[in-house]
Interface confidence: low
């Protein structure tokens, strides 16, 4: 019966000790609600068939309802065309006329939407961008479409989402759904792994030069993943860079310039979606001194019969801290003069007349002498003693 029962119960104990329940029942028949009232807030889910490209509307009700002209099986209305309205008249024996007229506003076809990755490769280590794209046209009103994303504990009501400040090399799961007139009609999930991040900074243990042409640098590698190292060494304005194997923790620099300050920078890098360089660790050293190169453009000119003016140009490579020019004057195998100046400009006076001299000029950098530049020159006859003729040798 459709009547509602109002029951009142009394309980007594029988002689045997068992409980006897006697029930007095009063039958009442309240009026049934109308189907329009009963199903006023009915909700619908749309299921899409990719082969037929048609939708099924699933009515979210507890009992098996009837659908008037539109036949429905197990509360499902079949073969609905995208973006077309269908009217369904819902009735059930628990409610009276008028029936609930449900307008089914059928959403666009599911394959007309694609969840697209819009992450910039340069930022793919710490960001994720996802965006729904309409890849085909449809006649539904786009104003009625809403998009929802949930990534972890974050929910977005956007067509496009950007997650920032993420951890590199981490997996993130994002679920998304599209609703038409607040009815979900498609969803998608992505498991996204953020890209490799920039490697950390290597830790330099020491960086020094123990020879004029060599230096050494040793380091501990960074913690995070990386592919290789780049070691750059800069002297004055010149810069040279080397690609070093990831397993190296020491590098010997060769063919360096003596007594020169070198600034070294070492960074790790990884080639992921793009190349990412880690922070550079810096250090510097000055190479040891070495013998300077030879002075050049040396000239010996006579300023009088027994005086000479010796000049030369500085060496191309000083290779040491100080700057001093030395001149040695030899007659035969005897050292007759030994002078030292700040500049290569020597005035040698009071030499013997008509004598062959060897002039040796070299540079001394405070640590090492350079190769001497050697010239031979002779003094003249004493022209003041021989007024009757001038003799130049």
């Amino acid at each position: 019966s459709d009547a509602y029962l109002n029951a009142s119960e009394t309980t007594t104990l029988s002689p045997s000790g068992s409980a006897v329940i006697s029930t007095t029942t009063i039958a009442t028949t309240p009026s049934k609600p109308t189907c329009d009232e009963k199903y006023a807030n009915i909700t619908v889910d749309y299921l899409y068939n990719k082969e037929t490209k048609l939708f099924t509307a699933k009515l979210n009700v507890n009992e098996n309802v009837e659908c008037g002209n539109n036949t429905c099986t197990n509360n499902e209305v079949h073969n609905l065309t995208e973006c077309k309205n269908a009217s369904v008249s819902i009735s059930h024996n628990s409610c009276t006329a008028p029936d609930k007229t449900l307008i089914l506003d059928v959403p666009p076809g599911v394959e007309k939407f694609q969840l697209h990755d819009c992450t910039q490769v340069e930022k793919a280590d710490t960001t994720i961008c996802l965006k729904w794209k309409n890849i085909e046209t449809f006649t539904c009103d786009t104003q009625n479409i809403t998009y929802r994303f949930q990534c972890g504990n974050m929910i977005f009501d956007n067509k496009e989402i950007k997650l920032e400040n993420l951890e590199p090399e981490h997996e993130y799961k994002c679920d998304s759904e599209i609703l038409y007139n607040n009815h979900k009609f498609t969803n998608a999930s992505k498991i996204i792994k953020t890209d490799f991040g920039s490697p950390g900074e290597p830790q330099i243990i020491f960086c020094r030069s123990e020879a004029a042409h060599q230096g050494v640098i040793t380091w501990n590698p960074p913690q995070r993943s990386f592919h290789n190292f780049t070691l750059c060494y800069i002297k004055e304005t010149e810069k040279d860079c080397l690609n070093l194997d990831k397993n190296l923790i020491k590098y010997d620099l060769q063919n360096l310039k003596p007594y020169t300050k070198y600034v070294l920078s070492l960074h790790a890098y990884i080639i992921a979606k793009v190349q990412r360089n880690g922070s550079a660790a810096m250090c510097h050293f000055t190479t040891k001194s070495a013998p300077p190169s030879q002075v050049w453009n040396m000239t010996v000119s006579m300023t009088s019969d027994n005086s000479m003016h010796v000049k030369c140009r500085p060496p191309r490579d000083r290779n040491g801290p100080h700057e001093r020019y030395h001149l040695e004057v030899e007659a035969g195998n005897t050292l007759v003069r030994n002078e030292s100046h700040k500049n290569c400009d020597f005035r040698v006076k009071d030499l013997q007349y008509s004598t062959d001299y060897t002039f040796k000029a070299y540079f001394h950098n405070g640590d090492y002498p350079g190769e001497p530049f050697i010239l031979h020159h002779s003094t003249s006859y004493n022209s003041k003693a021989h007024h009757h003729h001038h003799h130049h040798h």
């Epitope: 992505k190 498991i191 996204i192 792994k193």
Partner: nanobody, 127 residues
Framework: QVQLQQFGGGLVQAGGSLRLSCAAS????????MGWFRQAPGKEREFVAA????????YYADSVKGRYTISRDNAKNTGYLQMNSLKSEDTAVYYC????????????????????WGQGTLVTVSS
């Protein structure tokens, strides 16, 4: 355009091992994510394993985790599926697939997102 050619497969005893390979020709393989799928007789195609473009990220179906290993050699333009401890329920036609939608978020488990497919190779595990 990428063409995928599969090698390997055949009959193997339960508990045995097999290695499938998938050689790519055409465009540079290193720009593509790669996956393996399988279809047993009378069943739908299912995801087996996938690897991202660099080989840095791998994904496996729960049913093969710990037994299968996916890898790739970009220099040889080839992907591999090493299958160990095979069971009779692993019997299926195995397909390799590649997709150039690689930045961050291809759904590697979703066959619909792969553009290019191999011809398939039959793996039969006898008990």
């Amino acid at each position: 355009q990428v063409q995928l050619q599969q090698f390997g497969g055949g009959l193997v005893q339960a508990g045995g091992s097999l290695r499938l390979s998938c050689a790519a020709s055409g465009r540079t393989f290193s720009g593509y994510a790669m996956g393996w799928f399988r279809q047993a007789p009378g069943k739908e195609r299912e995801f087996v394993a996938a690897i991202n473009w660099s080989g840095g990220s791998t994904y496996y179906a729960d049913s093969v985790k710990g037994r299968y290993t996916i890898s790739r050699d970009n220099a040889k333009n080839t992907g591999y599926l090493q299958m160990n401890s095979l069971k009779s329920e692993d019997t299926a036609v195995y397909y390799c697939a590649a997709s150039d939608w690689v930045v961050g978020g291809i759904s590697l488990m979703n066959g619909a997102e792969y553009k290019y497919w191999g011809q398939g190779t039959l793996v039969t595990v006898s008990s």
